[in-house]
């Protein structure tokens, strides 16, 4: 029968760790960590790395109990927690009977928005104390609310991920500019900043109708040049507040109608957190 | 029936290359490891190298890591070996080997003995 | 690398006779050992994998033993076709490398 993994959670040091090995099996020949999406019962889906290893090609791999992965987070606060992989089977070939190396994968680690985490392994068992054993480690940093995978979490459409406010911007003339976007449910406060290199005018908009998608207007005095100026808008929401995804625009020539024009250049960026 | 072949012999120059083939059938190509080994006048056996056929990934002794090239074409079930810049020192019969489960060498070409000459 | 010491360098035997070769590596190798029989002119031929294993179509004559760094063939009841070259073989993690050989021949 070929080899399989069974994992489970390993906080500690491994018993191994404290015996003493005359021969250890070497190190991983490949690391690799991707982001894979899993449903959850409320509805949303949860992200979790897929982390896959390749063993090396010879003999000393018929050593092999186990691999540990270990993984730390950095965000906000520190994460840290460790998987043992125990291999079902002793090696009896040193490629699969297929051909290729043998590959193993755990699913499990779950993954927060916008983290970098250290992702490390190695075999058991491993060197002994005082030694350095053959070890492998990887980074992978998870993407935020504008991911395309990750913007359909609730997390992230509370935080507007999903929303569109379509801004059309028009210098109206040397004093003013009109902004219009459309507004969202998700929340009743924005605040619309004019830069061209600096701030040259900036407003804020409170929208008391919440409930339902409107088209906001507002007319911003402006101390400068705007044309081809950007303009950010901000919103405030209740789980991000003032650190939701913000929207950019560029300021063009009202028409003669005062109507401004639509743009199709509009962007997104996230402020300083994403959620 | 497992079978490694390989051309009888080689006649080259010194400071030219020869590149050498073992066609292989009777069992799955990617699934093994192939080696090569040289064998000189009178002497014992030394390992190349290997090649996975699978993903082409290679190991060298130190030794000929500049002296030996080691390629595979999977479509026609065949490893090749190239060695640079021959001298003298070359002179040898070079066999390939295709490992067991592990690195024992299960099956050996008949070899082929390149001769270094002016 | 792990250097593999052959002895004896060669043999000068009868037929019927009883011969062991020995083999040391100059570390632990886990018996990850092979012996290869070479006729003269010929590529080498599996003989024994493993320390052990006999490969397919090896009489029983030939046995394998050994652990750790030491290694021995023996050859009960010594045939003629058994003359040739012989060497030992480690294959624990690359570079492998061979022992230099015990020339096996009739007395």
């Known amino acids: 029968r070929e080899p399989t993994v069974q994992c489970g959670s390993e906080t500690g040091p491994s018993p191994e760790w404290m015996l003493q090995h005359d021969l250890i099996p070497g190190d991983l020949r490949d690391l690799r960590v991707e982001p894979v999406t899993t449903s959850v019962a409320t509805g949303d889906y949860s992200i979790l790395m897929n982390v896959s290893w390749v063993l090396r090609a010879d003999a000393s791999i018929r050593l092999l109990k186990a691999t540990k992965i270990c993984v730390t987070g950095k965000s906000n606060f520190q994460s840290y927690s460790c998987v043992r992989c125990n291999y079902t089977e002793a090696f009896q070939t040193q490629t699969r009977p297929s051909g290729g190396k043998w590959t193993f994968s755990y699913i499990g680690f779950p993954v927060e928005l916008n983290t970098v985490y250290f992702i490390g392994a190695h075999n058991i068992p491993n060197a002994n104390m005082n030694e350095d054993g053959p070890s492998m480690s990887v980074n992978f940093t998870s993407p935020g609310c504008l991911d395309h995978i990750m913007k359909y979490k609730k997390k992230c459409v509370k935080a507007g991920s999903l929303w569109d406010p379509n801004i059309t911007a028009c210098k109206k003339n040397e004093e003013t500019v009109e902004v219009n976007f459309t507004t969202t449910p998700l929340g009743n406060r924005y605040m619309a900043l004019i830069q061209h290199s600096t701030i040259i005018g900036f407003s804020q908009v409170f929208e008391p109708h919440q409930k339902k998608q409107t088209r906001a207007s507002v007319v911003i005095p402006v101390t400068g040049d705007s044309e081809g100026a950007t303009v950010q808008l901000t919103p405030y929401f209740p789980t991000c507040g003032s650190d939701c995804i913000r929207h950019k625009g560029t300021v063009v020539l009202c028409p003669q109608t005062g109507v401004p024009f639509p743009l199709d250049n509009n962007k997104s960026k996230p402020g300083g957190w994403l959620p | 029936q497992v079978q490694l072949q390989q051309p009888g012999a080689e006649l080259v120059r010194p400071g030219a290359s020869v590149k050498l083939s073992c066609k292989t059938s009777g069992y799955t190509f990617i699934s093994y490891w192939m080696n090569w080994v040289k064998q000189g006048p009178e002497q014992g056996l030394e390992w190349i190298g290997r090649i996975d056929p699978y993903d082409s990934e290679i190991q060298y002794n130190q030794k000929f890591k500049d002296k030996a090239i080691l390629t595979v074409d999977k479509s026609s079930s065949a490893a090749y070996m190239q060695l640079i810049s021959l001298t003298s020192e070359d002179s040898a019969v070079y066999y390939c080997?295709?490992?067991?489960?592990?690195?024992?060498?299960?099956?050996w070409g008949q070899g082929t003995l390149v001769t270094v000459s002016a | 690398d792990i250097q593999m010491t052959q002895s004896p360098a060669s043999l000068s035997v009868s037929v019927g006779e009883t011969v062991t070769i020995t083999c040391r590596a100059s570390e632990n190798i886990n018996s990850n050992l092979a012996w290869y029989q070479q006729k003269k002119g010929k590529s080498p031929q599996l003989l024994v994998y493993d320390v052990t294993n006999l490969a397919d179509g090896v009489p029983s004559r030939f046995s394998g033993s050994g652990s750790g760094t030491q290694y021995s063939l023996k050859i009960n009841s010594l045939q003629s076709e058994d003359f040739g070259s012989y060497y030992c073989q480690h294959f624990w993690r690359p570079p492998y490398t061979f022992g230099g050989g015990t020339n096996l021949e009739i007395k």
């Open positions: 080997a295709r490992s067991g489960g592990f690195d024992w060498f299960a099956y």
